[in-house]
């Protein structure tokens, strides 16, 4: 999906009002410096691409993020504020329903959510100084 035509300010507002808090809740008890940055993004569409990938694509050691509160709110925000996003996600959602629903917070998941926090911060960053 091409995130170029999303309403970035509306997504930013959704992040600031709820998604950010849910990410903090998930990470509670974890030091903010515990994980180094291993993923970055270079503009708002790119950030959303990487956020979608980390939030909804199962990875080795962390297959369970899509059912978390922050993930569901992320999905809702993208569905509302990114034209045509919902249609592209129907097949992915059906595939996800077939997986086992076992809620385990692994260290790998914590690391992944830490990377998500970094990506969201970059998405919401103010304009950089004139370099």
């Amino acid at each position: 999906y091409d995130f170029t035509n999303c309403d970035f300010e509306k997504i930013k507002a959704a992040y600031l009002s709820t998604i950010s808090k849910d990410l903090i809740t998930y990470m509670s008890g974890t030091k903010s410096t515990e994980f180094n940055n291993t993923v970055s993004c270079s503009n708002r569409p790119h950030c959303l691409t990487e956020i979608q990938s980390l939030t909804f694509n199962p990875t080795a050691g962390c297959a369970s993020l899509a059912k978390e509160m922050f993930a569901m709110k992320t999905k809702a925000a993208l569905a509302i504020w990114c034209p045509g996003y919902s249609e592209t996600q129907i097949n992915a959602t059906q595939a996800m329903k077939k997986r086992r629903k076992r809620k385990v917070t692994t260290n790998k998941c914590l690391e992944q959510v830490s990377q998500l926090q970094g990506l969201w911060r970059r998405f919401n960053r103010p304009l950089l100084k004139q370099q």
Epitope: N37, S40, N43, R122, K129, Q131
Partner: antibody, heavy 122, light 108 residues
Framework: QMQLVESGGGVVQPGRSLRLSCAAS????????MHWVRQAPGKGLEWVAV????????HYADSVKGRFTITRDNSKNTLNLQMNSLRAEDTAVYYC???????????????WGQGTMVTVSS | SYVLTQPPSVSVAPGQTARITCGGN??????VHWYQQKPGQAPVLVVY???DRPSWIPERFSGSNSGNTATLTISRGEAGDEADYYC???????????FGGGTKLTVL
Amino acid sequence: QMQLVESGGGVVQPGRSLRLSCAASGFTFRTYGMHWVRQAPGKGLEWVAVVWYDGYDTHYADSVKGRFTITRDNSKNTLNLQMNSLRAEDTAVYYCSRSPQWEDIFESMDIWGQGTMVTVSS
Amino acid sequence: SYVLTQPPSVSVAPGQTARITCGGNNLGSKSVHWYQQKPGQAPVLVVYDDSDRPSWIPERFSGSNSGNTATLTISRGEAGDEADYYCQVWDMSSDLVVFGGGTKLTVL
């Protein structure tokens, strides 16, 4: 463990070519800008070139423009520097480094390799 | 092209504060990054975006940037801080990375 490992250095005669490689691991390579920086013996750091996170664009120092080419292969997590028409003044340790990028601005170089030595001598 | 100027050397007594400067035209409008390099080793990022510090760098390292000068401050200097220090910016007008000439810090 995030890591950059350079290879391909060696001794080469003036006017000849050499290709350096940098293997990345432990991070999502395709999301970072990548640089080559060099350091001549006893001298300071000199930036050589940078390639965008997606390979879309490249920038070069005037001292190497037209002679060096920076490329990347995001499917293999590798960065390359093709060095042609080498000169004695290209003798240096060559480091690769990663840099977060925002739009067309490159940020700090937060991870560096250990470097590979290139000696240009007849 | 854009030029960054650093003093070739700075000395500090153990436990005292060292300040390394980096000068450039209207430097305060740019984000400055600082690197530490010990002999035979690769550079290490110690301060980025003027004053932010990577998680692995001690709080003794801090930075500031305004006007035409950026400053790297190392408080409570230790023997292990002896190294070369380089400032760096991205020059958007020319799409080039620029490094300062480097400053050799000696802990007396």
